[in-house]
């Protein structure tokens, strides 16, 4: 058996750290059998024999000039095999960072704090902590650990399904190389790192015969979990075209009616979503969506809600994109106190 | 008892090729450089070149870079040395030592190769 | 390349006496150098490996030196089969090269 022990990575490749003592390992040979090393492609002999280091090689303090492939033979001459030096750095503690677009499961990402330029990969798991005791600071021993299971592909990210909201866990991340390992310990609850997908499907509609009024709908973000437990709330955003400051509201629901909208220019409006109870972050805004206020004459007759709403309100199915949910509050209605003030604003 | 066997003398008209082949026995094959050199009548030797055990690289001497080839067949533990465009300066007596990376420990008993119009 | 010159081109001596034969190269080599001997109609042998270093069954009338760019043979005792022409290699560089060899013959 060779008595070179096999480090992670391919074959046949030996790794030292540059300005460090290196040694190489014959892997043809008998441990302490003498060797003789050579450059491959140079005749001359870097180590004979005779040197008293057996089967190894010592390059002292290695630079880059020193990476390659090197040949080792016997003491007839025979091939004891090639060895290629690469030179890196151990690893240093990744950096971590978790993230939540809904309150079932997480995710987190790594990247390395440090170029090692050796092979590299990483080992992730996690535990789940539990408290003891509303106000104790003890931790119960700790539950796992588990695997975190990696993207594939190579993709630096690990998921963990079937989270617990209220539950806090320690993330390990481990970046391994055939120097050495290092470990970056993070402990995550999914309540500080919740940021939800922002709202889907957003439109802008004007509302006839009103110039100053956009109505703007939307949905949960498809990445939300059915289950009513668990809401969103949102914030809106307008301007006017070429308008650089931005309007901002807090819808009660998943549409708002806007009423102050400059007539006859195109608006842009976004939306993003949070918790209700105000966990974690704001979403990311939602792509644009542009509409322009309604040009023509209003009705005679102010016709009731109903009538206004030309899609009558249907609760939407389990696996449609909004989930069922409690109103937080009453729909706006299309019409308020503000109308008369309108109306007489348009009839000027 | 490490034998290594090359073929027979061979006479060449200038611009033919001449292959010379050596068969080793008593060791194993892919352990070693084989090594091919060349002693022209009363002058001293010329390094050809030499080939790898067992991934069969070469290192060349540039002199014969562009008309040496040097093979090996793994499967009949025989080398071979083929020499292009010959001419009459490479009348000489042809070798394959086996040997280490540089050095060259057992030969062949050589291969007169006379190249005549 | 580098160059080897050997010397003297022949060496006439008596058996029993000590030869002395000497290799020099065209730069620098370290301790890449080593030697053969060559008797009429055969193939080489060798006999000294870098520089100093003796080869299993070869007497030890046989001993080298030297480093960088001069080296020297000696044959301590010469006997009757050591009568032959003997060549210096060196393996510091690509292409390996060999002296033009030194005769040694009986005087």
């Known amino acids: 058996s060779s008595p070179c022990p096999q480090a992670w990575g391919p074959p046949g490749v030996q790794y030292g750290q540059p300005g460090r003592s290196v040694k190489l390992c014959c892997p043809g040979v008998t441990a302490g059998d003498p060797v003789s090393w050579f450059r491959d492609g140079e005749p001359k002999l870097l180590q004979g024999p005779d040197s008293g280091l057996g089967h190894e090689l010592v390059l002292a303090q290695a630079d880059s000039t020193d990476e390659g492939t090197y040949i080792c033979q016997t003491l007839d001459g025979a091939l004891g095999g090639t060895v290629t030096l690469q030179l890196g750095y151990p690893p240093a503690r990744p950096v971590v960072s978790c993230q939540a677009a809904d309150y079932e499961n997480f995710s987190c990402t790594w990247s390395p704090s440090q170029i090692s330029g050796l092979p590299t990969r990483y080992l992730t798991s996690y535990r789940k902590k539990t408290v003891l005791g509303a106000d104790s600071q003890r931790r119960s021993p700790s539950t796992g650990p588990w695997p975190c299971p990696q993207d594939p592909l190579g993709a630096a990210r690990c998921v963990v399904h079937g989270a617990e909201f209220w539950s806090q866990y320690r993330i390990n991340v481990t970046e391994v190389n055939p120097l050495g390992a290092s470990t970056r310990l993070l402990d995550v609850s999914l309540q500080s790192i919740l940021r939800p997908d922002p709202p889907q499907g957003l439109r802008v509609e004007s509302v006839p015969g009103y110039p100053r009024r956009l109505r703007a709908s939307w949905t949960y973000p498809a990445s939300w979990p059915c289950q009513p437990h668990f809401l969103l709330k949102f914030r809106l955003q307008y301007r006017p075209a070429q308008h650089p400051a931005w309007s901002t509201v807090e819808p009660a629901g998943l549409e708002e009616v806007i009423t102050d909208a400059v007539a006859g220019l195109p608006h842009a409006v976004r939306v993003s979503a949070r918790d209700f109870l105000d966990a974690g972050t704001w979403s990311t805004w939602s792509p644009e969506a542009w509409g322009t206020p309604s040009t023509g004459t209003i009705p005679k007759e102010i016709p009731a809600w109903g009538q206004l709403h030309t899609q009558p309100e249907v609760e939407p199915q389990v696996d449609s994109p909004a989930p069922p949910r409690p109103s937080l509050q009453p729909h706006p209605r299309l019409l308020d106190h503000r109308d008369s003030v309108e109306q007489v604003a348009v009839l000027a | 008892q490490v034998q290594l066997v090359q073929s027979g003398a061979e006479v060449k008209k200038p611009g033919a090729s001449v292959k010379v082949s050596c068969k080793a026995s008593g060791y194993t094959f892919t352990n070693y450089w084989m090594h091919w050199l060349r002693q022209r009548p009363g002058q001293g030797l010329e390094w050809i070149g030499n080939?790898?055990?067992?991934?069969?690289?070469?290192h060349y001497n540039q002199k014969f870079k562009d008309r040496a080839t040097l093979t090996v067949d793994k499967s009949t533990s025989t080398a071979y040395m083929e020499l292009s465009s010959l001419r009459s300066e490479d009348t000489a007596v042809y070798y394959c030592a086996r040997g280490d990376y540089v050095l060259f420990t057992y030969w062949g008993q050589g291969t007169l190769v006379t190249v005549s119009s | 390349d580098i160059v080897l010159t050997q010397s003297p081109a022949t060496l006439s001596l008596s058996p029993g006496e000590r030869a002395t034969l000497s290799c020099r190269a065209s730069?620098?080599?370290?301790?890449?150098l080593h030697w053969y001997q060559q008797k009429s109609g055969q193939a080489p042998r060798l006999l000294i490996k870098y520089a100093s270093q003796s080869i299993s069954g070869i007497p030890a009338r046989f001993s080298g030196s030297g480093s960088g760019t001069d080296f020297t043979l000696t044959i301590s005792s010469l006997e009757t089969e050591d009568f032959a022409v003997y060549f210096c290699?060196?393996?510091?560089?690509?292409?390996?090269?060999f002296g033009q060899g030194t005769k040694l013959e009986i005087k």
């Open positions: 730069q620098s080599i370290s301790n890449n």
């Open positions: 080939i790898g055990p067992s991934d069969s690289k070469t």
């Open positions: 290699q060196q393996s510091y560089s690509w292409p390996l090269t």
